[in-house]
Amino acid sequence: KAMHVAQPAVVLANSRGTASFVCEYASPGKATEVRVTVLRQADSQVTEVCAATYMMGNELTFLDDSICTGTSSGNQVNLTIQGLRAMDTGLYICKVELMYPPPYYMGIGNGTQIYVIDPEPCPDSD
């Protein structure tokens, strides 16, 4: 593999459909600009869930309509994905790219299997 990226094997989303996991990378150098992308792999299809580019020491900024939020600390990125439903259960891969300064390094994790269980609807109270 290229750059080493580690992430937990399994995470269970909470009852509100929120899942959090840490994506950690082993930086070969002193990167100042890092790009983190979350990919969802279902069957053989891979789709981008969200992406953020951040300067080391600064906050991650996802697009306003993104379902992801996150914080960074050193070579760790704490990612939170919101609004998940049971149908979103799948393998979520963390991709890290060291964009600046050169050289460019990239790596992908083995993926975090996120399980989402839709809450049971509340029974009607008489």
Partner: antibody, heavy 115, light 107 residues
Amino acid sequence: EVKLDETGGGLVQPGRPIKLSCVASGFTFSDNWMNWVRQSPEKGLEWVAQIRNKPYNYETYYSDSVKGRFTISRDDSKSSVYLQMNNLRTKDMGIYYCTGGFTYWGQGTLVTVSA
Amino acid sequence: DIQMTQSPPSLSASVGETVTITCGASENIYGGLNWYQRKQGKSPQLLIYGATNLADGMSSRFSGSGSGRQYSLKISRLHPDDVATYYCQNVLNTPYTFGGGTKLEIK
């Protein structure tokens, strides 16, 4: 200014060894995974070997075509990377480039294998 | 090992035209793809890294796109100076395989 200067190429007989050297300047050598890439008319560009840096315990990787015959090494104190090539074959002929990551490239040194 | 298939092997176009070179990987490389330009008698130069990012000092007429297994390099408003051989390369995994190259000529 970034510079990568390869030396050590030349004419060598099949089965004989040769050692290539590359001295780098103008960038942070210790932050780079260093590679050797070769170019031949038959095969175009071909990645040969990589040595990673201290955070990666100087791990080494080789293409199948050179595994067991070539050895890559580095000396961070001299900003240098080396390629020891043993048991050379005619198909090893070509221009050998030293690269920092894959961003910085040297001018190359020509290795000719012939009896 | 990941195989990289580049097409076309050669290409002839007129100054001012737009040309596209494609590169296919034998498996998903997650955007881990570089493009290089090699001019006659010169060393290869990094052109695009991470599938879409333009390397320092390269003309914005070059752009990269693609994901998964399929990638392309577009050269807009072709210049005589663009005559070169272009290579794609997998940078996700070792061995870091290159495509076979595309030789670009001007009509």
